[in-house]
């Protein structure tokens, strides 16, 4: 059963390491994949002393942990590298950090990247 699935055909692309990797630094990435597989967008970033440094954004292959996520939200508590994935075109344009501990109330730190 699949409820209200949104197709992902393109994602915001960013690569902080673009010169070494010989890619564009920023743009829109079309998402390719097998026709029977779902596609997602992702974002990964670091928080260096309160300053957000985007590492990469782009397309992500079919991954069940990305299903039914319309927003790109990292919920893990204090990761070294923040990661989120989502479904829907350009859904990784904005990403957020909502640490969700088992007992404590979630706190909100939404981020709009400006590469």
């Amino acid at each position: 059963a699949i409820l209200g699935r949104s197709e992902t055909q393109e994602c915001l692309f960013f690569n902080a390491n673009w010169e070494k990797d010989r890619t564009n630094q920023t743009g829109v990435e079309p998402c390719y994949g097998d026709k029977d597989k779902r596609r997602h967008c992702f974002a990964t970033w670091k928080n260096i002393s309160g300053s957000i440094e985007i590492v990469k954004q782009g397309c992500w292959l079919d991954d069940i942990n990305c299903y039914d996520r319309t927003d790109c939200v990292e919920k893990k508590d204090s990761p070294e590298v923040y990661f989120c994935c989502c479904e829907g075109n350009m859904c990784n344009e904005k990403f957020s950090y909502f640490p969700q501990m088992e007992v404590t109330q979630p706190t909100s730190n939404p981020v709009t990247p400006k590469p």
Epitope: A1, I2, L3, G4, R5, G33, D34, D36, K37, R38, L61, D62, D63, I64, N65, C66, Y67, D68, R69, K75, K76, D77, F83, C85, Q100, M101, E102
Partner: antibody, heavy 118, light 111 residues
Framework: EVQLLESGGGLVQPGGSLRLSCAAS????????MSWVRQAPGKGLEWVSA????????YYTDSVKGRFTVSRDNSRNTLYLQMNSLRAEDTAVYYC???????????WGQGTLVTVSS | QTVVTQEPSFSVSPGGTVTLTCGFN?????????PSWYQQTPGQAPRTLIY???TRSSGVPDRFSGSILGNKAALTITGAQADDESDYYC??????????FGGGTKLTVLG
């Protein structure tokens, strides 16, 4: 520490029903896809079912479609497997597994034994 | 119906190297299937060894490594030890929620 504790297994007659539960702790349950995997006595592991973070998408191996239903209660940190119309070939240890990015099983429960026999 | 194939059994001498493989009936295994590997000893729950083709799970010794060899996923154990004697399972993620286990390989460490 991540813990997955299955319960609800037991002896049931063919055609009967059982509901398995998996109580999760030590991680943000609502942020993880989950799966059920089973192992018949002396046999290999077999993926049974999976469910997305919200419960909005559910998946099954062909042999249990229409008979088994996977669900989750994110407020209770619990995963369920409702098993109806049970057959002898469903006899197995049922493991609950946490699914992480790259769609792999990063943590496993200790399993609960389901025996279908008359 | 996708069938994932593994060698049913394999033997290795202590200190030796063994490579277990994982293929499937409908084409080549690639990194997009996120191959993962699990170790299981009798009566125990499985233990995660390798995920995403070649990433070792936390606490797994570097004697275990994963790769793609030709059209199959592979698990290589170097410097095999007596306690590596176990069943090893590969899993391929077929997409759209579906995981498929291989039949498992029973590894015997000789001696």
């Amino acid at each position: 520490e991540v813990q997955l504790l299955e319960s609800g297994g037991g002896l049931v007659q063919p055609g009967g029903s059982l509901r398995l539960s998996c109580a999760a702790s030590g991680f943000t349950f609502r942020n993880s896809a989950m799966s059920w995997v089973r192992q018949a006595p002396g046999k290999g592991l077999e993926w049974v079912s999976a469910i997305s973070v919200t419960g909005g998408s559910t998946y099954y191996t062909d042999s249990v479609k229409g008979r088994f239903t996977v669900s989750r209660d994110n407020s209770r940190n619990t995963l369920y497997l409702q098993m109806n119309s049970l057959r002898a070939e469903d006899t197995a240890v049922y493991y609950c597994a946490k699914v992480y990015y790259y769609s792999f099983f990063d943590y496993w429960g200790q399993g609960t034994l389901v025996t279908v026999s008359s | 119906q996708t069938v994932v194939t593994q060698e049913p059994s394999f033997s290795v001498s202590p200190g030796g190297t063994v490579t277990l493989t994982c293929g499937f009936n409908s084409g080549s295994v690639s990194t997009s299937y996120y191959p993962s590997w699990y170790q299981q000893t009798p009566g125990q729950a499985p233990r995660t060894l390798i995920y995403n083709t070649n990433t070792r799970s936390s606490g797994v010794p570097d004697r275990f490594s994963g790769s793609i060899l030709g059209n199959k996923a592979a698990l290589t154990i170097t410097g095999a030890q007596a306690d590596d004697e176990s069943d090893y399972y590969c899993v391929l993620y077929m997409g759209s929620g579906i995981h498929v286990f291989g039949g498992g390989t029973k590894l015997t460490v000789l001696g």
